[in-house]
Amino acid sequence: DLKVEMMAGGTQITPLNDNVTIFCNIFYSQPLNITSMGITWFWKSLTFDKEVKVFEFFGDHQEAFRPGAIVSPWRLKSGDASLRLPGIQLEEAGEYRCEVVVTPLKAQGTVQLEVVASPASRLLLDQVGMKENEDKYMCESSGFYPEAINITWEKQTQKFPHPIEISEDVITGPTIKNMDGTFNVTSCLKLNSSQEDPGTVYQCVVRHASLHTPLRSNFTLTAARHSLSETEKTDNFS
């Protein structure tokens, strides 16, 4: 019997530019003789419903149709037909199919590959054109993919140490697509410092598919107005 097993759940997620290994394991009732077997990997884009051959291995020869694509003949002997793709790009997301032939048998497996890019986040203080006692804090998230992102603001006071979500005076701009296919977005928080307690900690919280835990950037309101430290102004908090 010949069977192929792919990533459990049918989806693999990989970071942009990573050297990704798309898993494909072969289960065969006899020891594998790689000279009598064939492996073909196919890719089908998310946007275009046509399959393209990525890599082919047949006993006496192997050919990469995507630069750098490789299946290790050494690992193949033990049933590992996983495909390695160096420097994975956003446009390479889609369905990958591992086809295994041990003549006269043939088996297939498919997996969805999602390519994600994590946002970089930074806090900026914009004082231009602001009224007395008014500050505008900007939380810039850049270089993320896919487009869906959630940016919220929270505050913690000495009285209420648990974070409270801020819903008023928050404006999140439209997402902007970069040349490389990633996205940027800026969320703004308007504060009236005269009405806020010194020592209050504000956080910009970024949630994205590429992040295991939310990305948090914070600043503390001090008694003196506009006293955001230089690091708080420009640091990349990713």
């Epitope: 006899q30 009598s36 073909t40 399959e51 047949f58 032939v101 003549t103 006269p104 043939k106 088996a107």
Partner: antibody, heavy 120, light 107 residues
């Protein structure tokens, strides 16, 4: 000219075994995989299994695993299928056929078929 | 196992008709579909492979199309010698399975 010549019709009793032969000519025997297909009551086709003469790799449909055994004799370019513990359900026409592509299993040449009748 | 459901079971035709036979796979088989013709008392004959590739010597009135689970086989202008049973087969994964057949009969 490619030819697949099968052995003649068989009339057997339930419980018996039979070995059907398929003698090939006109091509390099080891370059093609040999398959066997069952056709019952003139309509449906069922893949029984196949054998790669180069490596003696065999593969069977789960349904025929305990029913059929495929072998080859490279010296005479002949493929064989043995069917055991015959019942009336095994009465059918059996074809040998070949596939040549490395990753595709379409059957380009077929034998003339061997009619097997199992009856008490 | 992948089930190939072919329809119709039989199709009454006249010479010159355009005929379409469909085959539906129980799961995606990419484009790994084959079509055969079988005349009474004869062995099956290969007509098309990889969905749309005509085998050597097969007239261009025979065409195939489809992808994934839905496939069609068309005879643009039926001729008398086309009266036969037509079978689809998937060679996407073993065990390789066939459709139940479609019989082309005189109307």
């Amino acid at each position: 000219e490619v030819q697949l010549q099968q052995s003649g019709p068989e009339l057997l009793k339930p419980g018996a075994s039979v070995k059907i032969s398929c003698k090939t000519s006109g091509y390099t025997f080891t370059d093609y995989t040999m398959h066997w297909v069952k056709q019952s009551h003139g309509k449906s086709l069922e893949w029984i299994g196949g054998i790669n003469p180069n490596y003696d790799n065999t593969g069977y449909s789960e349904k025929f695993k305990d029913k059929a055994t495929l072998t080859v004799d490279k010296s005479s370019s002949t493929a064989y299928m043995e069917l055991r513990s015959l019942t009336s359900e095994d009465s059918a026409v059996y074809y040998c056929t070949r596939s040549g592509s490395r990753r595709s299993f379409y059957f380009d040449y077929w034998g003339q078929g061997t009619t097997l009748t199992v009856s008490s | 196992d992948i089930v190939m459901t072919q329809s119709p079971d039989s199709l009454p035709v006249s010479a010159g008709d355009r005929v379409t036979i469909t085959c539906k796979a129980s799961q995606s088989v990419s484009n790994d579909v084959v079509w055969y013709q079988q005349k009474p008392g004869q062995s099956p004959k290969l007509l098309m492979y990889s969905t749309s590739n005509r085998y050597i010597g097969v007239p261009d009135r025979f065409t195939g199309s489809g992808y994934g689970t839905d496939f069609t086989f068309t005879i643009s202008t039926v001729q008398a010698e086309d009266l036969a049973v037509y079978f689809c087969q998937q060679d996407y994964s073993s065990p390789y399975t066939f459709g139940g057949g479609t019989k082309l009969e005189i109307k």
